[in-house]
């Protein structure tokens, strides 16, 4: 048993048909020493007396909220939460596997730049009796702070017969240093607790690995005279980091007809421009990654040919 | 700024040749960037690589003050790469494929690290672990990792090349 | 943590010399740049001299320079600051650093590890 925030404390249990469980004592908080009675969340059945109470903890009939009273009035609460562990495996049930990158992925998380500043975000089923706490840090053995907002519900959807939601998190590094190889990851780690259930989720990455920039900006088409070429330009996005000239992305310019089985026309290039032949009723798309490490590339910018 | 007894570098072919090494190291192994290597353990392999850190003065603001700072230890990385790309993780089993781009990634490397130091300057150059993997799998972990820290330095040292030759070039 | 400590300072003439030692303990000493900075009674404490984790490559400021040598043995984990011909307006509090942040390389915020400081204290 260890304790995960002040009167609220996680059970860890081997879940098996006809585990043994874990003996908890709890202590009631009060200079009292007598006339001591204990209840179990809104019942009034009296579990035990005295300053100390033992029980054996095996199911989640077992977890809740114990109260410690004398003659009517409380002195003191222990929550108790179980973290269910089944064949050596810590349990996964309140976040939905993304599956992206890899399997067991629960969390996700996304940089726009190097700045020290990530969203991470996760996936679940479950509606109410539902909360998050997000700690992290940059190394474990001797951690240098990363300080993480509240986790908020940022989108709903549907699929299928479910309804899917999706929380998600900022954090910024307190002394980041954009211009550095990092050499320790940032680790993330979420704290989930449905009802009484109690589950731990972690992530571990580099900035640069999960560097996606936003889509170039002002993207603009001229046309070349007496041709069918077009001369297509951008910007760098505001949320890259500066100066262009260390922190350089490349570019990748699309000619896309109006089928999706249209051959696709693709430049790649350094420039903030590029010439290409624009077809009838196809679009031009640029996208952008950091130019000198392989991270994920920006969503689409798009603008129509015509 | 001056430096005494140090030269600008030709910031112009650096930063080609960062740039080239940069594409090199990721066709080297493209899958690396789908690994996970932290989860394979093993961590003190690569512990001892010399890293581009926070305070050696490869941020623009240092490279404004006095570029050497930076150039040594990028110097200092690039010969270490250099060593453990002609070591036996590499040219021991399993053997690399004969078009594999690790040959051309050495010498490129090589090339990058006398661009920094002209015939005649001798540089105290890091010591590199004695790693001698016994396993073929382990060597071919520890390429992976290797590679995988290699494309996080030239990624660093092409940024710092890039802004010299735009900001710094006489 | 880095632990540094400066000795060799003291009270000398003008025109003679000093060396200046810093030790340190902790931390791989020889993984980072290396500075030198003083401080006058009621003055900013200002940079002197800085020097690579390889001891290569220098720097110093303009009053200083031809007259202070910085170099630092990293077998040994210390730093020196050889300083001749030394004027009363070198008299302040030496100290010694390491720089473990981005920034200018001779703006002492860059640098997190500190030692106590030598007095040097130069008559005319």
């Known amino acids: 048993i260890w304790e995960l925030k002040k009167d609220v404390y996680v059970v860890e249990l081997d879940w098996y048909p006809d585990a043994p469980g874990e003996m908890v004592v709890l202590t009631c908080d009060t200079p009292e020493e007598d006339g001591i009675t204990w209840t179990l969340d809104q019942s009034s059945e009296v579990l035990g007396s005295g300053k100390t109470l033992t029980i054996q903890v095996k199911e989640f009939g077992d977890a809740g909220q114990y109260t410690c009273h004398k003659g009517g009035e409380v002195l003191s609460h222990s929550l108790l939460l179980l973290h269910k562990k089944e064949d050596g495996i810590w349990s996964t049930d309140i976040l939905k596997d993304q599956k992206e990158p890899k399997n067991k992925t629960f969390l996700r998380c996304e940089a726009k730049n190097y700045s020290g500043r990530f969203t991470c975000w996760w996936l679940t089923t479950i509606s109410t009796d539902l909360t998050f706490s997000v700690k992290s840090s940059r190394g474990s053995s001797d951690p240098q702070g990363v300080t993480c907002g509240a986790a908020t519900l940022s989108a709903e959807r549907v699929r299928g017969d479910n309804k899917e939601y999706e929380y998600s998190v900022e954090c910024q590094e307190d002394s980041a240093c954009p211009a550095a190889e990092e050499s320790l990851p940032i680790e993330v780690m979420v704290d989930a607790v449905h009802k009484l259930k109690y589950e731990n989720y972690t992530s571990s990455f580099f900035i640069r690995d999960i560097i996606k920039p936003d889509p170039p900006k002002n993207l603009q088409l001229k046309p070349l005279k007496n041709s069918r070429q077009v001369e297509v330009s951008w910007e760098y996005p505001d949320t890259w980091s500066t100066p262009h000239s260390y922190f350089s992305l490349t570019f990748c310019v699309q000619v896309q007809g109006k089928s999706k089985r249209e051959k696709k026309d693709r430049v790649f290039t350094d420039k903030t421009s590029a010439t290409v032949i624009c077809r009838k009723n196809a679009s031009i798309s640029v996208r952008a990654q950091d130019r000198y490490y392989s991270s994920s590339w920006s969503e689409w910018a798009s603008v129509p040919c015509s | 700024r001056a430096v005494p007894g140090g030269s600008s570098p030709a910031w112009t072919q650096c930063q080609q040749l960062s740039q080239k090494l940069c594409t090199l190291a990721w066709s080297a192994h493209p899958l690396v960037g789908h690994m996970d290597l932290r989860e394979e353990g093993d961590e003190e392999t690569t512990n001892d690589v010399p890293h581009i850190q926070c305070g050696d003065g490869c941020d623009p603001q240092g490279l404004r003050d006095n570029s050497q700072f930076c150039l040594q230890r990028i110097h200092q990385g690039l010969i270490f790469y250099e060593k453990l790309l002609g070591s036996d993780i590499f040219t021991g089993e399993p053997s690399l494929l004969p078009d594999s781009p690790v040959g051309q990634l050495h010498a490129s490397l090589l090339g990058l690290s006398q661009l920094l130091q002209p015939e005649g300057h001798h540089w105290e150059t890091q010591q590199i672990p004695s790693l001698s993997p016994s396993q073929p799998w382990q060597r071919l972990l520890l390429r992976f990792k290797i590679l995988r820290s290699l494309q996080a330095f030239v990624a660093v040292a092409a940024r710092v090349f890039a802004h010299g030759a735009a900001t710094l070039s006489p | 943590e880095v632990q540094l400590v400066e000795s060799g300072g003291g009270l000398v003439q003008a025109g003679t010399s000093l060396r200046l030692s810093c030790a340190a303990s902790?931390?791989?000493?020889?993984?980072?740049?290396m500075g030198w900075f003083r401080q006058a009674p009621g003055k900013e404490r200002e940079f002197v001299a800085i020097?690579?984790?390889?001891?290569?490559?220098?720097d110093y400021r303009d009053s200083v320079k031809g007259r202070f040598t910085i170099s630092r043995d990293n077998a040994r984990n210390t730093g020196y600051l050889e300083m001749n011909s030394l004027k009363p307006e070198d008299t302040a509090v030496y100290f010694c650093?390491?720089?473990?942040?981005?920034?200018?390389?001779?703006?002492?915020?860059?640098?997190?590890?500190w030692g106590q400081g030598t007095q040097v204290t130069v008559s005319s």
């Open positions: 650093a390491l720089r473990t942040r981005s920034g200018s390389l001779f703006d002492p915020g860059t640098f997190d590890y």
């Open positions: 902790g931390r791989t000493f020889s993984n980072y740049i």
């Open positions: 020097i690579t984790a390889n001891g290569v490559a220098t």
